[in-house]
Interface confidence: low
């Protein structure tokens, strides 16, 4: 039975040319995370595999950085980056958990950055 839940940064906005952190967190399960995929609609952005490490899709390697943790940092944002992003946690024995983030990239300098992190 799948008991886990994924928390995400939710709906976020950022300014064109800026950067944003996409972050998901899997909780309420003891399942082992074997791999995390980051996808933008139907495109694979990056994979973090427990054994093999990170792989960044070549078409995104200049604008995507791994981290923080299992999250993803997008840089040099354009309006074309607006859309849905998915974190897909492959776990054993639970199976697959998916989180959704919607990013809106704004032309205006008053874009509010939704991805805020508190120091633990």
């Amino acid at each position: 039975m799948m008991t886990g839940t994924i928390e995400t940064t939710g709906n976020i906005s950022a300014e064109k040319g800026g950067s944003i952190i996409l972050q998901c967190h899997l909780s309420s399960t003891t399942a082992q995370v074997t791999q995390v995929n980051w996808e933008q609609q139907d495109q694979l952005l990056a994979i973090c595999n427990a054994d093999l490490g990170w792989h960044i899709s070549p078409s995104f390697k200049d604008r995507v950085a791994p981290g923080p943790g299992l999250g993803l940092t997008l840089q040099s944002l354009t309006v074309n980056d607006t859309g849905e992003y998915f974190c897909i946690y492959h776990t054993y024995p639970d199976g697959t958990y998916t989180g959704r983030i919607f990013l809106e990239v704004l032309e205006s300098s008053v874009a509010e950055h939704g991805a805020r992190f508190q120091i633990p």
Epitope: H25, V33, C48, N49, A50, L52, G53, W54, P66, G67, P68, G69, L70, G71, P120
Partner: nanobody, 111 residues
């Protein structure tokens, strides 16, 4: 439990250099990833640089050509060599591995 301990911060004049260290202990699922972030007073935490097992590195545009990130996998330690420091580099610098954060080390660039 993962523990991250940063060191190497301090006061430096503009144009000067500092080398930050981040020692990690405990088990991490990070794909060999370690990163540096910084937070200036009244501002959001900002990504600075990342390094992966195998030597792959990424830098924020604001530090490219001035900062160099590296890692010693045998020591579970990441380093941030900061050259040509500017007053706008003043911030608390945090190390990140596998969703764990250190307590940070303060870097002040001032004459």
């Amino acid at each position: 439990e993962v523990q991250l301990v940063e060191s190497g911060g301090g006061l430096v004049q503009p144009g000067g250099s500092l080398r930050l260290s981040c020692a990690a202990s405990g088990n991490t699922f990070s794909g060999g990833f370690m990163g540096w972030f910084r937070q200036a007073p009244g501002k959001e935490r900002e990504w600075v640089a990342s390094v992966l097992r195998g030597g792959y590195t990424w830098y924020a545009d604001s530090v490219k050509g001035r900062f160099t990130i590296s890692a010693d996998n045998s020591k579970n330690t990441a380093y941030l060599q900061m050259n040509s420091l500017k007053p706008e580099d003043t911030a608390v610098y945090y190390c990140d591995a596998a969703d764990y954060w250190g307590q940070g080390t303060l870097v002040t660039v001032s004459s």
